[in-house]
C-alpha cells in the first residue's frame, strides 16, 4: 500500500513538475524590466526564450519573436536546449510511469517489469528536473551578469538587441516557475525510485541450484534475467521453476508470488 502511494504521489508530483517546466519554457517573462531606476515607466519590457515583449500603459502589448537562430547568444540556445531536453525526458518518463503504476494492470505484466519501468521513469524525472533547474540557473546567471554590465551601448543576452541606458532586466516569473517545477520533477523522480525498491522482488536473481540427476551434480543458474526484468516467453499460469531444485546449501527455494505471470 505504501509503495503504491509513494509511486502514485511520485507520478502526480512529476506530472505537476513537467507541466510547470512546459509552462516556464513557453512563458515570456524570463526576464523583466528592472523598475528600480524608473518605477513609473509607461513601457514595460519583458523577455522570454522565444520572443521579447512590451506592455504599454495604453494596455497594448506587442511581442517580437527572435527570428534569427545564428544571431542568438550561445547561452540562450543552451537554455532552450536544456529546457527542451527536460520536457522530452519528462514526457517519456510520464509515458513509461503510466504503464509502471501498480494500480494499473496491463495484460500480464510482472511486478518486476513494473519495478524496472518505475526506476526508468524515476531516473528520467530526475534528469528532467536537473535539466530544468540547470537551464533556469544558467539564464539567471546570464541576467545577473548582464544586469551589472548594463551600459548604453552594450548588447544584452537577448538576441543582440541594443540595451538602452535606462533598461536593465531582472528575474522574471518564469525563472521561479522553472525552479519550482524542476524541483518538483526531481522530487517526483526520487519518489519513483524509492517506490521501485518496494516493487522489486525480494531476490531478483535466484541462487544457483544443484540438480541431482544421473548420479552427478550440475550447477545451474536458471532465469536470472527473466526474474529481474519480467521479459520472458512464459505467459501461462504455471510455475517457472521445478520444486525439485535444491540450492547449493540444500535449502528449498520456493517460487515466490513473482514467479506467477
Amino acid at each position: 500500500m505504501a509503495v503504491t502511494a509513494c509511486q502514485g504521489l511520485g507520478f502526480v508530483v512529476s506530472l505537476i513538475g513537467i507541466a510547470g517546466i512546459i509552462a516556464a519554457t513557453c512563458m515570456d517573462q524570463w526576464s523583466t524590466q528592472d523598475l528600480y531606476n524608473n518605477p513609473v515607466t509607461a513601457v514595460f519590457n519583458y523577455q522570454g526564450l522565444w520572443r521579447s515583449c512590451v506592455r504599454e500603459s495604453s494596455g497594448f502589448t506587442e511581442c517580437r519573436g527572435y527570428f534569427t537562430l545564428l544571431g542568438l547568444p550561445a547561452m540562450l540556445q543552451a537554455v532552450r536546449a536544456l529546457m527542451i531536453v527536460g520536457i522530452v525526458l519528462g514526457a517519456i518518463g510520464l509515458l513509461v510511469s503510466i504503464f509502471a503504476l501498480k494500480c494499473i494492470r496491463i495484460g500480464s505484466m510482472e511486478d518486476s517489469a513494473k519495478a524496472n519501468m518505475t526506476l526508468t521513469s524515476g531516473i528520467m524525472f530526475i534528469v528532467s528536473g536537473l535539466c530544468a533547474i540547470a537551464g533556469v540557473s544558467v539564464f539567471a546567471n546570464m541576467l545577473v551578469t548582464n544586469f551589472w554590465m548594463s551600459t548604453a551601448n552594450m548588447y544584452t543576452g537577448m538576441g543582440g538587441m541594443v540595451q538602452t541606458v535606462q533598461t536593465r532586466y531582472t528575474f522574471g516569473a518564469a525563472l521561479f516557475v522553472g525552479w519550482v517545477a524542476g524541483g518538483l520533477t526531481l522530487i517526483g523522480g526520487v519518489m519513483m525510485c524509492i517506490a521501485c525498491r518496494g516493487l522489486a522482488p525480494e531476490e531478483t536473481n535466484y541462487k544457483a541450484v544443484s540438480y541431482h540427476a544421473s548420479g552427478h551434480s550440475v550447477a545451474y543458474k536458471p532465469g536470472g534475467f527473466k526474474a529481474s526484468t519480467g521479459f520472458g516467453s512464459n505467459t501461462k499460469n504455471k510455475k517457472i521453476y521445478d520444486g525439485g531444485a535444491r540450492t547449493e546449501d540444500e535449502v528449498q527455494s520456493y517460487p515466490s508470488k513473482h514467479d506467477y505471470v
Epitope: N38, A42, V43, S52, C53, S57
Partner: antibody, heavy 118, light 113 residues
Framework: EVQLLESGGGLVQPGGSLRLSCAAS????????MSWVRQAPGKGLEWVAT????????YYADSVKGRFTISRDNSKNTLYLQMNSLRAEDTAVYYC???????????WGQGTLVTVSS | DIVMTQSPDSLAVSLGERVTMNCKSS????????????LSWYQQKPGQPPKLLFY???TRESGVPDRFSGSGSGTDFTLTISSVQAEDVAVYYC?????????FGQGTKLEIK
Amino acid sequence: EVQLLESGGGLVQPGGSLRLSCAASGFTFSSYTMSWVRQAPGKGLEWVATIIIGGSYTYYADSVKGRFTISRDNSKNTLYLQMNSLRAEDTAVYYCTRLVKGSAMDYWGQGTLVTVSS
Amino acid sequence: DIVMTQSPDSLAVSLGERVTMNCKSSQSLLSSGNQKNYLSWYQQKPGQPPKLLFYWASTRESGVPDRFSGSGSGTDFTLTISSVQAEDVAVYYCQNDYSYPFTFGQGTKLEIK
C-alpha cells in the same frame, strides 16, 4: 464616432476645488487608458494625469501630485479629474484624451477652461 | 524626468517648400523589447485641440496626409513636411511616451511666408 466631451470648468478662487468630467462615447471606454492634458493660455501642452484601463494605476505630473485625483467610472463611461487646492498656475484649458498604441493620444476632447483667480 | 527640446521655435516657409523640424530627448526613447521609439508628434491648429500625427516616432496615424513623415531613433527625431500646404499652419509638438511624467516639447510654430 469617438467623442470626448469635457465639462465642469469655470472660475474658481485660489485654494478652491473643482471637478472636471469627461463623457466618452463611440468606443469601449473600459478598454482604454485615459489621460488629462492641459494648456495654459498662449502656452504649450502639459500632461496632467493618466489612469490605466482597470483604474488600479494612476500617474500624475509633479506639479499636481497630492492635489489632483484622476478617476473613472466605466459603468458611466466617464473620466473625472478632482482638483483641490487650486492655484493661479492651474489656469488652463483641460483636455480629456484617449491613449492608444505607443501610449499616444489619438482622440482629444474640445477642452474645458479652468480659471483660478481671486 | 525626460526633457524634450524642439527646434526651431518657429519657422516661416513658402507654399510647396520642404520643411523639417527636430525634437531631442534627454534620454533614449527606444524600447529594447520591441525596438520601437516611444515618441509621438501632434499638430495643433489655432483654436483646436491637438491632433495625433505619428506614434512610435514614424508610424503615421490614419488620415494623416503622406506628405508628413516622421523619423529618428534614440534621442533625435525629425518631422518632415515634403510640400507645405496652407492648412499645415499650426504648432507642432513632440511628446515622450516612454516614461512618466509624459513630457511635451515646447512646440515649433509653422507659418507661411
